[in-house]
Amino acid sequence: EVEKTACPSGKKAREIDESLIFYKKWELEACVDAALLATQMDRVNAIPFTYEQLDVLKHKLDELYPQGYPESVIQHLGYLFLKMSPEDIRKWNVT
């Protein structure tokens, strides 16, 4: 788990964009809002995040949706799907 640290001045993410690829793990944790991530999941797969970075993003989504991801998020998982465990998938209420 990434240690919680304050987001550096000027680095708070206003949108999910390619600049985030250059954020370190702790910066992603501190500077990316989980709700923003959830509403812009369609952008995540277009950005070549490393799996180390995707672990951080998954952790943020897990905190936001402890009971399982909504369909709007599941539809846009892309590479993040490869990080899902059977336990994660069992929580999904997919119609």
């Epitope: 070549p48 490393t50 799996y51 490869l82 990080k83």
Partner: nanobody, 118 residues
Framework: QVQLVESGGGLVQAGGSLRLSCAAS????????MGWYRQAPGKERELVAV???????LYADSVKGRFTISKDNYTNTLYLQMNSLKPEDTAMYYC????????????YGQGTQVTVSS
């Protein structure tokens, strides 16, 4: 398992150029993202350049306009052309590869040292 072997580092004066190479053990057509990291003594590792399919390039602000990432699909080699080098570019440079099929590993090479003297 993917092996990455870097070369091309060395000592150069400020304002000079170097070209780093990274030889991959598999066809890089199978690799959907590759990049160069660097780590200076006592500092965190930072990503400086990325190339993703199909040949889309991204650069950290600190190297934009000075560094160019490219790859050769025939020799399975990743490059980093570094121009207008500064003393603050001194670091160990590492090649990395990820998004290889369904493999969820981020692969790294052993690194090559770049030292820029003033």
């Amino acid at each position: 398992q993917v092996q990455l072997v870097e070369s091309g580092g060395g000592l150069v004066q400020a304002g000079g150029s170097l070209r780093l190479s990274c030889a991959a053990s598999i066809s890089i057509r199978r690799i959907n993202a590759m990049g160069w990291y660097r780590q200076a003594p006592g500092k965190e590792r930072e990503l400086v350049a990325v190339i993703s399919s199909p040949n889309k390039t991204l650069y950290a602000d600190s190297v934009k306009g000075r560094f160019t990432i490219s790859k050769d699909n025939y020799t399975n080699t990743l490059y980093l052309q570094m121009n207008s080098l500064k003393p603050e570019d001194t670091a160990m440079y590492y090649c990395s590869a990820w998004r290889i099929g369904v493999d969820t590993t981020d692969y790294y090479g052993q690194g090559t040292q770049v030292t820029v003297s003033s």
